[in-house]
């Protein structure tokens, strides 16, 4: 058992052009916090896969408000270390994900909102008990500087925290066959309980007589390195010079999978299929529980009450991801019908409906003419979500309540004079023009551009075409 410790030194704009905008502003002050996720081995796993070695969240950092016009500085960080306890052996090789999260503290409806600012990932080799390792990782225009180490919790010691130490029984020396426990020289190694000959560097045991191998080693005593070169036979040729495994006991011999996991051989080593709630190369690690608060943005943690059951997050509408960490553009689903305008208010979705439509999603087509009478003999016409009156001659306006001035639009062309008449309008045309709207010139020879004028009317007389 032991603890992986992560110390964040700085988070801010990386070198070079294109400095990122500050994530906080006077209108939207915010503070940072960090999440670390550890997985055993060097496998490239998806960000959403379980943090089989463990995970931790930092405290919130100090509230930060951007100074207008100033470039984004290194942002204020939370105090303290991020600590990820591990229960069993330290695997020696591990993958990490470090996420920088922003908590917005503005007056937006719904209180604090969380959003992921940056995510860095890597794969490292690390011996427990060693010094702090320093690292710099970049995510887009951001740069994260940090240090990390793994340390064993007493009584465990060694590069994998698998050797046990006990206080000396005699003041001067350790018992027969037992070495001092460096660096705790006043303690002695506990009596060996592993299978005789089990490699002290590459093997470990949790029960008497067994020998389990750390990643990269195989064989009954964990003394055979797993080769990355290609081998000809399933377990490699017998030639020791090739670096391949010699024929012999398989990597699943003695079942290296803990907690009821089942072992299957792979070309390079072995693979454990773990029961629900256990993870890791040898099913030695149980996952994050609901007590770790893994669900962001108001997500509810379901299941995961104990390490034997995996949790899931039920996300509020507008968020998704295994930890509700991703904001969804809910308007992209076009929930508003009939041309309504979608507004994502964060705490709720609203549709602004076009005229003639109603309902939360503008799904109700209002009967535009229902209860709407058109006055003075007008008739109601539905269309385009808005009612319209087709008015009888001499009336106008939205409901045909206004007496129309037929001459208001100056309908008589070429200087003709307009007269309002009970049945419409009459144009008195200027000399040389004729037609209902004085639109046709009379030709100099007296012939009009139209067929002959109606009987009884001379060209130039007021024309009334009703």
């Amino acid at each position: 058992a032991g603890v992986f410790e992560l110390q964040i030194h700085s988070f801010g704009p990386g070198p070079g052009p294109g400095a990122p905008r500050s994530p906080c502003s006077a209108r939207l002050p915010c503070r940072l916090f960090f999440r670390v996720c550890l997985k055993p081995g060097l496998s490239e796993e998806a960000a959403e896969s379980p943090c089989a070695l463990g995970a931790a969240l930092s405290a919130r950092g100090p509230v930060y408000t951007e100074q207008p016009g100033a470039p984004a500085p290194d942002l204020p960080l939370p105090d303290g270390l991020l600590q990820v306890p591990f229960r069993d052996a330290w695997p020696g090789t591990f993958s990490f994900i470090i996420e920088t999260w922003r908590e917005e503290l503005g007056d937006q409806i719904g209180g604090p909102a969380w959003s992921l600012l940056a995510r860095v990932a890597g794969r490292r080799r690390l011996a427990a008990g060693g010094p702090w390792a320093r690292d710099i990782q970049r995510a887009g225009a951001w740069e994260l500087r940090f240090s990390y180490r793994a340390r064993c919790e007493p009584p465990a010691v060694g590069t994998a925290c698998t050797r046990l130490c006990r206080p000396r029984s005699a003041p001067s020396r350790c018992g027969p066959g037992l070495r001092p426990c460096a660096p705790l020289e006043d303690e002695c190694e506990a009596p060996l309980v592993c299978r005789a000959g089990c490699s002290p560097e590459h093997g470990f045991c949790e029960q008497p007589g067994e020998c389990r191998c750390l990643e990269g080693w195989t064989g009954p005593l964990c003394t055979v390195p797993v080769s990355t070169s290609s081998c000809l036979s399933p377990r490699g040729p017998s030639s020791a010079t090739t670096g391949c495994l010699v024929p012999g006991p398989g990597p699943c011999d003695g079942n290296p999978c803990a907690n009821g996991g089942s072992c299957s051989e792979t070309p390079r080593s072995f693979e454990c299929t773990c029961p629900r709630g256990f993870y890791g190369l040898r099913c030695e690690v149980s996952g994050v529980t609901c007590a770790d608060g893994p669900c962001f943005n108001g997500g509810l943690c379901v299941g995961g009450a104990d390490p034997d059951s995996a949790y899931i997050c039920h996300c509020p509408p507008g968020f998704q991801g295994s930890n509700c960490e991703k904001r969804v553009d809910r308007c992209s689903l076009q929930p508003c019908r009939n041309g309504g305008l979608c507004l994502d208010l964060g705490h709720a979705l609203r549709c602004r409906c076009r005229a003639g439509f109603a309902g939360p999603r503008c799904e109700h087509d209002l009967d535009d003419c229902a209860g709407r009478a058109c006055a003075n003999g007008g008739t109601c016409v539905e269309g385009g979500g808005a009612h319209r009156c087709s008015c009888a001659l001499g009336f106008g306006g939205r409901d045909c309540r206004e007496r129309a001035d037929p001459c208001a639009a100056r309908p008589c062309a070429h200087g003709g004079r307009c007269y309002a008449h009970f049945s419409g309008l009459v144009c008195a045309c200027a000399p040389g023009y004729m037609g209902a709207r004085c639109e046709f010139p009379v030709h100099p020879d007296g012939a009009s551009a139209l067929p002959a004028a109606p009987p009884g009317l001379r060209p130039g007389d007021p024309q009334r075409y009703l």
Partner: antibody
Amino acid sequence: QVQLQESGPGLVKPSETLSLTCTVSDDSISNYYWSWIRQPPGKGLEWIGYIFYSGTTNHNPSLKSRLTISLDKAKNQFSLRLSSVTAADTAVYYCARVFNWGFAFDIWGQGTMVTVSS
Amino acid sequence: EIVLTQSPGTLSLSPGERATLSCRASQRISRTYLAWYQQKPGQAPRLLIYGASSRATGIPDRFTGSGSGTDFTLTISRLEPEDFAVYYCQQYGTSPLTFGGGTKVEIN
């Protein structure tokens, strides 16, 4: 303003199934989680379960084996069925909308009293 | 499940006085996912506070929520006649959702 209205029988016999419906007006049922909560006479509140329009449900483990929550998008309703009822299930049953910033309850029905008695 | 214990069970105060209600959780509530409700006789509960400290829409600023981890407080700075009611806390970080047993604020 969104309104919730519970409906169902006020009296249920022991060992029978309690069925209640909640009708949502002035909002689409498709945007929220919808929940049932109950309150025995003179006692505190107990969460029963919730449903999302996608079909996701979550039930109180103490009731899970007897509980069914379903949703009818066309009618803008969601329902509760609690089987094998006893006198201990006598309570005011509330339907409520789950708040969009977390699983608190921002809009409640006025509640309906259900008595389990023979 | 997370058990919420509210204290005191009953609080006898006069209008204008300050009320301090406590809600203690049996284990840490993640991300301050705690709400407070007010319930008057014959009525449904009404959401007052969510996220431990954010007031719900239309709630007067005399209601203030605070706390984190396992200890949370609802403070009513100056009691108005309409504030005499039963108050419940509720956690929504971990399923099952649970409520406290309630604190009754009554007129002294």
